[in-house]
């Protein structure tokens, strides 16, 4: 029950997180014009990953897409890539996790398969969340650098006669959405990985192992052993045979990866 709840909650949290990552990626307010001490401005600039916008005090808003790939800063391209990778991994993770949900029955899918899928989706969510957090953080760092650079030369002009106010940009709403969404996806992924441990079957029956002893052939079927649930030293699960024994399909008989999530 607790496993199902953990898995379900992990799925929902990840779903919200990925929806947030998608929203942040599409949002125009990655960077917004710094208003200094003036909350009301006649022309307000803000920029996203895909286009920049200008909102006038008259109420008109005009947005222009970045219709170039080569002319864009490498950092912006990197942020785009990170966000897209995050979305793709998250989407695949969601697809996998739907089939992995304990509450959903699909044919005669074994718990071990569901555990595998849960772990896979969990890892995907973790990487997706990290990609989003990294993307947003890179953009934020870029903004901070540019902010102080433009503050240093806030006013430029000839002999101070004519002033050109340089537009400074600060953190937009999309950054906070991205950070929160990335965090949620990460948490959801961790929850999925935790749930995976509980989904691993209590009794793991292994296929017949053939022992090729000298002189005669003996087929030995072990009764199986309890799957370890601890992270400590595994004293009970000793190697059955040290010699040239192999399972028929090369499945190793020592503890499965689910024991070490």
């Amino acid at each position: 029950m607790a496993v199902t709840a953990c898995q379900g909650l992990g799925f929902v949290v990840s779903l919200i997180g990925i929806a947030g990552i998608i929203a942040a990626t599409c949002m125009d307010q990655w960077s917004t014009q710094d208003l200094y001490n003036n909350p009301v401005t006649a022309v307000f600039n803000y920029q996203g990953l895909w286009r920049s916008c200008v909102r006038e005090s008259s109420g008109f808003t005009e947005c222009r897409g970045y219709f170039t790939l080569l002319g864009l800063p490498a950092m912006l391209q990197a942020v785009r890539a990170l966000m897209i990778v995050g979305i793709v991994l998250g989407a695949i993770g969601l697809l996998v996790s739907i089939f992995a949900l304990k509450c959903i029955r699909i044919g005669s899918m074994e718990d071990s398969a569901k555990a595998n899928m849960t772990l896979t989706s969990g890892i995907m969510f973790i990487v997706s969340g990290l990609c989003a957090i990294a993307g947003v953080s890179v953009f934020a760092n870029m903004l901070v650098t540019n902010f102080w650079m433009s503050t240093a030369n806030m006013y430029t002009g000839m002999g101070g006669m004519v002033q050109t106010v340089q537009t400074r940009y600060t953190f937009g709403a999309a950054l906070f959405v991205g950070w929160v969404a990335g965090g949620l996806t990460l948490i959801g992924g961790v929850m999925m990985c935790i749930a995976c441990r509980g989904l691993a079957p209590e009794e793991t029956n292994y296929k017949a192992v053939s022992y090729h002893a000298s002189g005669h052939s003996v087929a030995y079927k072990p009764g199986g052993f309890k799957a370890s649930t601890g992270f400590g030293s595994n004293t009970k699960n000793k190697k059955i045979y040290d010699g040239g024994a192999r399972t028929e399909d090369e499945v190793q008989s020592y503890p499965s990866k689910h024991d070490y999530v």
Partner: antibody, heavy 115, light 113 residues
């Protein structure tokens, strides 16, 4: 078609108060008051976002003038207090448009401050 | 606040003449976000409300004759009437539409020679 009709102008004594109205018909996101003293140029007074009621003023009018709007009546107001002789002017309401230009103007209402 | 300086303050011209009015701002009116200059031109006739001619320094308002044109960027702007018509004799104002407070130039009166 947008129509702006001002009212409320007239003769007032120095130190007195007056409230100008501008009846607005048609879509307006933001509105302005602009004044013109006799024989002088145009002077911007104040701006308001008609949806949020957020205002901003020219420095000379902060504290003395208040721009506001009444959603139900679709009316713009300019409350003028502590009036001085130099406030004598024709007051226009104007709608903000693309490029922050003022595309529609009222006919103007004359305010005379005199003892 | 941005100061707007128009020149000349008045000029005399004949019908058919090419007229140029200049406007200088104390700060750049060019917005980096959309690369547009927030400079507006108005025409005002005696006893009438002003009329919007040009916004974004060079975009003609709908219904305004094509003989009117605007140009300039940064701090220097120009209003040109290619061929002056009798109805064009009026006072012309430039306006900073880039930042509050919006400020107007002192005006240029175009009179009949």
């Amino acid at each position: 078609e947008v129509q702006l009709v001002e009212s409320g102008g007239g003769l007032v004594q120095p130190g007195g108060s007056l409230r100008l109205s501008c009846a607005v018909s048609g879509y307006t996101f933001s509105m302005n008051w602009v004044r013109q003293a006799p024989g002088k140029g145009l002077e911007w007074v104040a701006w308001i976002n008609m949806y949020t009621g957020e205002p901003t003023y020219a420095d000379d009018f902060k504290g003395r003038f208040t721009i506001s709007r009444d959603d139900s009546k679709n009316t713009l107001y300019l409350q003028m207090n502590s009036l001085r002789a130099e406030d004598t002017a024709v007051y226009y309401c104007a709608r903000s448009s693309r490029g922050n230009g003022f595309d529609y103007w009222g006919q103007g209402t004359l305010v005379t401050v005199s003892s | 606040d941005i100061q707007m300086t128009q020149s000349p303050s008045s000029l005399s011209a004949s019908v058919g003449d090419r007229v140029t009015i200049t406007c200088k701002s104390s700060q750049s009116l060019l917005n980096s976000g959309n690369q547009k200059s927030y400079l507006t031109w108005y025409q005002q006739k005696p006893g009438k409300a002003p009329k919007l001619l040009i916004y974004w320094a060079s975009t003609l308002e709908s219904g305004v004759p094509s003989r009117f044109s605007g140009s300039g960027s940064g701090t220097d702007y120009t209003l040109t009437i290619s061929s002056l018509q009798p109805e064009d004799f009026a006072t012309y104002y430039c306006q900073n539409a880039y930042s509050f407070p919006f400020t107007f130039g002192q005006g240029t009166k175009v009179e009949i020679k």
